[in-house]
């Protein structure tokens, strides 16, 4: 990692395993408006590779609610509304950070966890086209 | 939030603003293999709404590196490799949690931050506005 100069105004850490365990302020600074993904855009319905959104809830995790995308079709929707099965609807996945209560049920102790979530779907061709 | 029963084996918190500030173990539990998004799949190239991946680096943030998707075209790529501008390539966005060093440069003190990232692109039918 990058060496960060220690600021004299930093909170002190008594932890032997420092910096494995850190203090985190849960008062979230939001750089954008948080919304239910269904409200944020209607791409899930208008896409040529539309998807359903499944609610995944876990009280031992922060955030406790995560939305998972599942593609509606094997193929992709054409302009006439029919599905072209020679194309594929595929999920776009992303690794995200969540906080997992550890030990379980503890309100003030967490461990960072990486999970893979499907965010939406895209339509792919079995062949790669190089567009000039 | 959901009320979590207090476990007697939980670490104690002396913080007046409890549970605003919590202890987080940075020893990440990875539920999947972490990879560079370019290696994980070639969807960014094979999609009818292909995208480029831009590296966004910030040493004051954890994770310090985030990949941002930018759609390559306004329209969508057809089977013949040409772009159909009657359709739109749009970014699929997701809100993710990151840790922001606070105060700045402090190695063991963070604040949770929500940021909006573009994960990939999908091809959508444009909304037609009917002018009276």
């Amino acid at each position: 990692g990058i060496a960060i100069p220690r600021n004299s105004g930093c909170p002190n850490s008594e932890d032997k395993n420092f910096p494995r365990t850190v203090m985190v302020n849960l008062n979230i600074h939001n750089r954008n408006t948080s919304t239910n993904p269904k409200r944020s855009s209607d791409y899930y319905n208008r896409s040529t590779s539309p998807w359903n959104l499944h609610r995944n809830e876990d009280p031992e995790r922060y955030p406790s609610v995560i939305w998972e995308a599942k593609c509606r079709h094997l193929g992709c929707v054409k302009a006439d509304g029919n599905v072209d099965y020679h194309m594929n609807s595929v999920p776009i996945q992303q690794e995200i950070l969540v906080l997992r209560r550890e030990p379980r049920h503890c309100p003030n102790s967490f461990r960072l966890e990486k999970i893979l979530v499907s965010v939406g779907c895209t339509c792919v061709t079995p062949i790669v086209h190089h567009v000039a | 939030g959901i009320a979590i029963p207090r476990n007697s084996g939980c670490p104690n918190s002396e913080d007046k603003n409890f549970p605003r500030t919590v202890m987080v173990n940075l020893n990440i539990h990875n539920r999947n293999t972490s990879t560079n998004p370019k290696r994980s799949s070639d969807y960014y190239n094979r999609s009818t709404s292909p995208w480029n991946l831009h590296r966004n680096e910030d040493p004051e943030r954890y994770p310090s590196v985030i990949w941002e998707a930018k759609c390559r075209h306004l329209g969508c790529v057809k089977a013949d490799g040409n772009v159909d501008y009657h359709m739109n390539s749009v970014p699929i966005q997701q809100e993710i949690l990151v840790l922001r060093r606070e105060p700045r440069h402090c190695p063991n003190s963070f604040r949770l931050e929500k940021i909006l990232v573009s994960v990939g692109c999908t091809c959508v039918t444009p909304i037609v506005h009917h002018v009276a």
Epitope: N52, H54, R55, K70, C71, R72, H73, L74, Y85, S89 | -
Partner: nanobody, 124 residues
Framework: EVQLVESGGGLVQAGGSQRLSCTAS????????MGWYRQAPGKQRELVAL???????DYADSVKGRFTISRDNAKNTVYLEMNSLKAEDTAVYYC??????????????????WGQGTQVTVSS
Amino acid sequence: EVQLVESGGGLVQAGGSQRLSCTASGTIVNIHVMGWYRQAPGKQRELVALIFSGGSADYADSVKGRFTISRDNAKNTVYLEMNSLKAEDTAVYYCAAEIGYYSGGTYYSSEAHWGQGTQVTVSS
């Protein structure tokens, strides 16, 4: 939830035959389409054959006349009869279906589901 379970893969001689089957189970309301895709080493996943709820079928050009897809609606099962097999048919074969089903009290009118895949190896 929905599960697709394949069976019937394995090693076969060139010119020989093989039959794959796949059964869908779970909180299924209806199956719109069922079929098979395949992925050969270093290649992209491609369509092999699909059968629709009305009984019509769609085949990849490379398998037309050699492969036959059929379906038992009562058993939520799809079959792929593969004849005159060639070395280029070697791939992992994935069962796939578009299914309307219930999950957590919500009805999803259509969702794509995939099996784990079964290896078919054609030796020349």
